[in-house]
Amino acid sequence: DSEEDEEHTIITDTELPPLKLMHSFCAFKADDGPCKAIMKRFFFNIFTRQCEEFIYGGCEGNQNRFESLEECKKMCTRDNANRIIKTTLQQEKPDFCFLEEDPGICRGYITRYFYNNQTKQCERFKYGGCLGNMNNFETLEECKNICEDGPNGFQVDNYGTQLNAVNNSLTPQSTKVPSLFEFHGPSWCLTPADRGLCRANENRFYYNSVIGKCRPFKYSGCGGNENNFTSKQECLRACKKGFIQRISKGGLIKTKRKRKKQRVKIAYEEIFVKNM
């Protein structure tokens, strides 16, 4: 079972640098479109951070689709050599906190939250249900945790630690969950399946964080949330690697998970979309 193959990956303390995309469409999911042709194309996978092959149906789809691997790399990857490797402490807000609110192109209007850089606080906004950008949070708390400054000049980082602006010392921040487990996948992997507002019955997969497996559900065709994948493989790739167990300073090691119905602290995989 491919699910089990992913269980024991070693993750070191020096993680990948934050992903800075040259174009926002590089963050789109691979979309084969409604047609039935079998055409080899390439897309940029934000989770593996590399260009990968997929089968395109020949019509519609989105801009994250390239004729060749080279074209994909040229459009969606940068030379990483001159980038500073991210340490475990994130001292600044993610880039996406500074993006303007983006309702997207759909019309299943729902309430979401974004960080308003003018007012320096998280606010609600009217989201259309699809696309937009990453300055988009399901809850006020999530928005505040990721984008707002903490009290007394602290910047709260994604790992439950505060950086004291005065002397750069680390102050542990109390959390509601045992610090032994953390979720380092996208936060939407923890959301329930959401059919959305339309009347279609599309076969999709969502990640069930209680049982730790990707499960099928029927999608209405619009609205819903981002825990929504066209294939089980895509769902697993995005969400299955999320739970990790922290062990000493030597690193982080993936464990075979026995899931409990407990709240988990979210630490985003940073995907910073830069519109050029």
Epitope: R124, F125, L197
Partner: antibody
Framework: EVQLVQSGAELKKPGASVKLSCKAS????????MHWVRQAPGQGLEWIGE????????NYNEKFKTRATLTADKSTSTAYMELSSLRSEDTAVYYC????????????WGQGTTVTVSS | EIVLTQSPATLSLSPGERATLSCSAS???????LYWYQQKPGQAPRLWIS???ILASGVPARFSGSGSGTKYTLTISSLEPEDFAVYFC?????????FGQGTKLEIK
């Protein structure tokens, strides 16, 4: 003390337009959303739309998008709602109400403006 | 849009009795985004309960709110004369924001 004071009653003919005002005081006008809600005689409440005066962000109920125009004057802390192409079913009490930027708890309301549309 | 249906339309009870007002949504809404307002004749509505169960400032403890998904309830444990009014449920999970048609709580 937070206060929302609305303009006086209006009598209009079908097809005409009406512009209602809501003057805010006792709080920072630009830091809150201002909503417009109407109530037809003996009926429930109907949300028309909202405006956040600082950045001019506006959300309309699609039902009113072509006929309602929400504006705000920051210098006088006054919100306005103009409703065009009036018909008899627009006869209602129109309220302004404020809410914070994080939720839609309409914690302060104006006294209401009665608009009567009759030929 | 989300349609909120309140029942009963009118509830006739005596002071001291228990009142249960229901609000049913056409689609599931987040409990955080379900509010209640009270309105008395000739007055503007007043915020009464936010986030399904959080009483607004000045609301007596005999009021309580509960529910999730599509079913929400406002309960008054023992009616006082000042409780007789119209109560509206309100959702802001989806746009446009919508209100129920109201339940009129009248003295029997």
């Amino acid at each position: 003390e937070v206060q929302l004071v609305q303009s006086g009653a209006e009598l209009k003919k079908p097809g005409a337009s009406v512009k209602l005002s809501c003057k805010a005081s006792g709080y920072t006008f630009t830091s809150y959303w201002m909503h417009w809600v109407r109530q037809a005689p003996g009926q429930g409440l109907e949300w028309i739309g909202e405006i956040k005066p600082d950045q001019g962000r506006i959300n309309y109920n699609e039902k009113f998008k072509t006929r309602a125009t929400l504006t705000a004057d920051k210098s006088t802390s006054t919100a306005y709602m103009e409703l065009s192409s009036l018909r008899s079913e627009d006869t209602a009490v129109y309220y302004c109400a404020r809410s914070s930027v994080v939720d839609v708890a309409m914690d302060y309301w104006g006294q209401g403006t009665t608009v009567t549309v009759s030929s | 849009e989300i349609v909120l249906t309140q029942s009963p339309a009118t509830l006739s009870l005596s002071p001291g009795e228990r009142a249960t007002l229901s609000c049913s949504a056409s689609s599931s809404v987040s409990s955080s985004y379900l509010y209640w307002y009270q309105q008395k004749p000739g007055q503007a509505p007043r915020l009464w309960i936010s986030g399904t169960s959080i009483l607004a400032s000045g609301v007596p403890a005999r009021f309580s709110g509960s529910g999730s998904g599509t079913k929400y309830t406002l309960t008054i444990s023992s009616l006082e004369p000042e409780d007789f009014a119209v109560y509206f449920c309100h959702q802001w999970s989806y746009y446009p924001f919508t209100f129920g048609q109201g339940t009129k709580l009248e003295i029997k």
